[in-house]
Interface confidence: low
C-alpha cells in the first residue's frame, strides 16, 4: 500500500528511537570517515523533518523518497570532496544512480584507527554521564567499520551493549563483569558482520536467484516440516529484507524484518515446532532468535527422492513447465532430508541436477540419460567430508595457533601476491573453523565448517576486490559462489611467483612487542611467518619451524632482559643473519 509520505510511514512504524538509530547507522555506513558529531547533527535534522511529516504528510518534501531525502542530506556535508575524493561525484547524479554510486564507494577496509577499549571506570563514567551519546557512539563506530552490518541486528547488539553496562557498572568487580561480555559482543559482532557481508555479496555479485537458492536450502534444513509453498513465501520475504539492507534501505529493511518475524510467529504451527520460545521474546530478541533457531526434526518416513526426480517419466515435462520452481522443489526436498550437508554442498548438488536436466531433456532418451544423476552426487559429497575430516584431525593435533600457522603457510604459497595483513586475517579466521566446528558430531560438522569457510573466503574476496593483485583469487571469487571453497582448496603452490626481496626491516622488532596481548603477539609472529614464506616460498616446513622457534625464543629472551631495546637491536641482527643462513636467503 502506497503512503503519501514514506519517511512519516517509517517513523511511525519504527518509533523515534529506532528511526534515529537506523538513520545513524545508514549515514555512518555511507560516510565512514565523517566525525561522530557531524553524523549526529545530520540525524537530528532528518528526525526533525520526519516529525513535521508525521504531523502533516502533505508538508513540503514529505512526499520524496527516502533515498532522495537521505542522499540530499549526505550531499550537504561540506568536506565531502576532500574527505572522500571521487565519492563527491555521486552528488551530481540523480536517484536511483546516486544511491548506487554511494553503495559502490562503501569501503570494507576503511582506513580507521583500531578501536581501543578504555579502562572500565572510564567507560562506566561515560555511560552514566550521557547514556544516549554513549550508545550512539557504539552504533556509529561499528557501522562505519562494518558498512554492510545487518542494521536491525546491530540494534539488538546495542541493546545487549547497554544491558552489559547497566548491570556491570554497579557490580562490585566491574571489570570481571563487563570485560567478558564486551569480548563476547565483539566476537559475535565480527561473525555477524561477516555473515551478512556474504549475503550482500551473494545478492550484489551473483543476483537474487543465487540468494534465493541459498535461502531455500537453509530454510528447508531449518524448517523441514514446512510445506514447499510456505518455505517459498519465507524465502521471498527474506530476500526482500536482505535486498533492502544490502541496498542501504535500512528503515524499510528493519520494518520488513519485524513483519516477517510477526508472520513466522503467527504461523509457527505450519513452520516449525522450535519457534515457541523465540516468539515469546521482545521484537529485537525475537528476530535474532528466529534467525538462529535450531533445525526442527525431520518428518518421519519421507519418501525417496528418486521417485519424483529420477524415476518419474514427467521429470522433463515438469522441468520445462517451470524450471526454477521444479529446481526449487528439488532443493527443498534434498535440503530437508539433509541437515548434515552444508548449504553450499546442497547448492552444488542442485546445480549438477540442473546441468544434467538441461543436457538430458534435449536427448533422444531423456530418462536413460538422467537415470544415474544421483551417482554423480557421491564425489561431491565425499570431497567436503574428507576435507573436514583431515582438517579436524590436524586441528586436534596442532591446536588453534599452530593450525592457523599451517593454513598461513598453505595460503601464502597458493596466493603469495595477496597483502600480508589480509593473509594473516583470513588464515587466522580459517583456522578458527577448528575450535568452532570440530567439537561437533559428524552430522553437524559439514554445515558448520563449510558454510563458515564460505563466510571467511568471502572476506578474502571482498578485500581482494578493493585492490586486485592475484588472477587466481579473482577467478575463485567470481566464477561460482558455491565453488569458491573447492576452488581455493584445489589451488597448488603458485610456481609463477617471484620471491619478494629480503628486507631486514620487516624482521626488525622492538620492545613494544613485550606489552602486547597474547593475541597481538601471535599476529606479529604470524605476520613474520607470511613474510618468510613470501621471501622463500620453497622453504620446507622444518626450515620455517626452526626459524619461528628461534624467533619465539628471541622475543622471550629480550622481553626478560633489563635493557629490552638493546637486546632487540643486537639479538635481532643475529636472528636475521641466522634466519637468512637457515633459509638460504
Amino acid at each position: 500500500d502506497a503512503h503519501k509520505s514514506e519517511v512519516a510511514h517509517r517513523f511511525k512504524d519504527l518509533g523515534e528511537e529506532n528511526f534515529k538509530a537506523l538513520v545513524l547507522i545508514a549515514f555512518a555506513q555511507y560516510l565512514q570517515q565523517c566525525p561522530f558529531e557531524d553524523h549526529v547533527k545530520l540525524v537530528n535534522e532528518v528526525t526533525e523533518f520526519a516529525k513535521t511529516c508525521v504531523a502533516d504528510e502533505s508538508a513540503e518534501n514529505c512526499d520524496k523518497s527516502l533515498h532522495t531525502l537521505f542522499g540530499d542530506k549526505l550531499c550537504t556535508v561540506a568536506t565531502l570532496r576532500e574527505t572522500y575524493g571521487e565519492m563527491a561525484d555521486c552528488c551530481a547524479k540523480q536517484e536511483p544512480e546516486r544511491n548506487e554510486c554511494f553503495l559502490q564507494h562503501k569501503d570494507d577496509n576503511p582506513n580507521l584507527p583500531r578501536l581501543v577499549r578504555p579502562e572500565v571506570d572510564v567507560m562506566c563514567t561515560a555511560f552514566h554521564d550521557n547514556e544516549e551519546t554513549f550508545l550512539k557512539k557504539y552504533l556509529y563506530e561499528i557501522a562505519r567499520r562494518h558498512p554492510y552490518f545487518y542494521a536491525p541486528e546491530l540494534l539488538f547488539f546495542a541493546k545487549r551493549y547497554k544491558a552489559a553496562f547497566t548491570e556491570c557498572c554497579q557490580a562490585a568487580d566491574k571489570a570481571a563483569c563487563l570485560l567478558p561480555k564486551l569480548d563476547e559482543l565483539r566476537d559475535e559482532g565480527k561473525a555477524s558482520s561477516a555473515k551478512q557481508r556474504l549475503k550482500c555479496a551473494s545478492l550484489q555479485k551473483f543476483g537474487e536467484r543465487a540468494f534465493k537458492a541459498w535461502a531455500v536450502a537453509r530454510l528447508s534444513q531449518r524448517f523441514p516440516k514446512a510445506e514447499f509453498a510456505e518455505v517459498s513465501k519465507l524465502v521471498t520475504d527474506l530476500t526482500k529484507v536482505h535486498t533492502e539492507c544490502c541496498h542501504g534501505d535500512l528503515l524499510e529493511c528493519a520494518d520488513d524484518r519485524a513483519d516477517l518475524a510477526k508472520y513466522i510467529c503467527e504461523n509457527q504451527d505450519s513452520i516449525s515446532s522450535k519457534l515457541k520460545e523465540c516468539c515469546e521474546k521482545p521484537l529485537l530478541e525475537k528476530s535474532h532468535c528466529i534467525a538462529e533457531v535450531e533445525n526442527d526434526e525431520m518428518p518421519a518416513d519421507l519418501p525417496s527422492l528418486a521417485a519424483d526426480f529420477v524415476e518419474s517419466k514427467d521429470v522433463c515435462k515438469n522441468y520445462a513447465e517451470a524450471k526454477d520452481v521444479f529446481l526449487g522443489m528439488f532443493l527443498y526436498e534434498y535440503a530437508r532430508r539433509h541437515p548434515d550437508y552444508s548449504v553450499v554442498l546442497l547448492l552444488r548438488l542442485a546445480k549438477t541436477y540442473e546441468t544434467t536436466l538441461e543436457k538430458c531433456c534435449a536427448a533422444a532418451d531423456p530418462h536413460e540419460c538422467y537415470a544415474k544423476v544421483f551417482d554423480e552426487f557421491k564425489p561431491l559429497v565425499e570431497e567436503p567430508q574428507n576435507l573436514i575430516k583431515q582438517n579436524c584431525e590436524l586441528f586436534e593435533q596442532l591446536g588453534e595457533y599452530k593450525f592457523q600457522n599451517a593454513l598461513l603457510v598453505r595460503y601464502t604459497k597458493k596466493v603469495p601476491q595477496v597483502s600480508t595483513p589480509t593473509l594473516v586475517e583470513v588464515s587466522r579466521n580459517l583456522g578458527k573453523v577448528g575450535s568452532k566446528c570440530c567439537k561437533h558430531p559428524e552430522a553437524k560438522r559439514m554445515p558448520c565448517a563449510e558454510d563458515y569457510l564460505s563466510v571467511v573466503l568471502n572476506q578474502l574476496c571482498v578485500l581482494h576486490e578493493k585492490t586486485p593483485v592475484s588472477d587466481r583469487v579473482t577467478k575463485c571469487c567470481t566464477e561460482s559462489l558455491v565453488n569458491r571453497r573447492p576452488c581455493f582448496s584445489a589451488l597448488e603452490v603458485d610456481e609463477t611467483y617471484v620471491p619478494k626481496e629480503f628486507n631486514a626491516e620487516t624482521f626488525t622488532f622492538h620492545a613494544d612487542i613485550c606489552t602486547l596481548s597474547e593475541k597481538e603477539r601471535q599476529i606479529k609472529k604470524q605476520t613474520a611467518l607470511v613474510e618468510l614464506v613470501k621471501h622463500k616460498p620453497k622453504a620446507t616446513k622444518e626450515q620455517l619451524k626452526a626459524v619461528m622457534d628461534d624467533f619465539a625464543a628471541f622475543v622471550e629472551k629480550c622481553c626478560k632482559a633489563d635493557d629490552k631495546e638493546t637486546c632487540f637491536a643486537e639479538e635481532g641482527k643475529k636472528l636475521v643473519a641466522a634466519s637468512q643462513a637457515a633459509l638460504g636467503l
Partner: nanobody
C-alpha cells in the same frame, strides 16, 4: 633433524601378540603425528595407523582395527604399536614415521621422517 629407531620385531605364531616401539631423538617437537606403515613382500608400503601428538586421537586401517593399538609416551619420545591376534598377512617390515600432519595421515607424503624399519614375521 629427527631420528627414528624401531624395535620389537621378530618371529611369532599366528594369534600371538607383539609390541613394537619407535624412539625419536634429535629435533623433536610435540605437534608431530606419529604413524606406522608396513611393506609386505612384493607389495607397496601401506598405512597401518597413526596417533596424534597428544595421544588422544588414533587412526587405523580397516584390516587392523580392533587388533592393533597405537599409543605414545611424550616424556620418553616413544610411540608403541601393540599388535594382538596376529595373522600371517601381517608379515611385513614395519616403519615408524613422523610428520606435522597437514592433510590426511594415511599418505606417505605427509610424513617428513622415517625409521629404517623392523621385520615382523607371523607363521601359521
Amino acid at each position: 633433524e629427527v631420528q627414528l629407531v624401531e624395535s620389537g620385531g621378530g618371529l611369532v605364531q599366528a594369534g600371538d601378540s607383539l609390541r613394537l616401539s619407535c624412539a625419536a631423538s634429535g629435533r623433536t617437537y610435540t605437534p608431530y603425528v606419529m604413524g606406522w606403515f608396513r611393506r609386505a613382500p612384493g607389495k607397496e608400503r601401506e598405512f597401518v595407523g597413526a596417533v596424534s601428538w597428544s595421544g588422544t586421537n588414533t587412526w587405523y586401517t580397516d584390516s587392523v582395527k580392533g587388533r592393533f593399538t597405537i599409543s605414545r609416551d611424550n616424556a620418553k619420545n616413544t610411540v608403541y604399536l601393540q599388535m594382538n591376534s596376529l595373522k600371517p598377512e601381517d608379515t611385513a617390515v614395519y616403519y615408524c614415521a613422523a610428520g606435522d600432519g597437514v592433510g590426511i595421515y594415511r599418505y606417505e607424503h605427509q610424513y617428513d621422517y622415517w625409521g629404517q624399519g623392523t621385520q615382523v614375521t607371523v607363521s601359521s
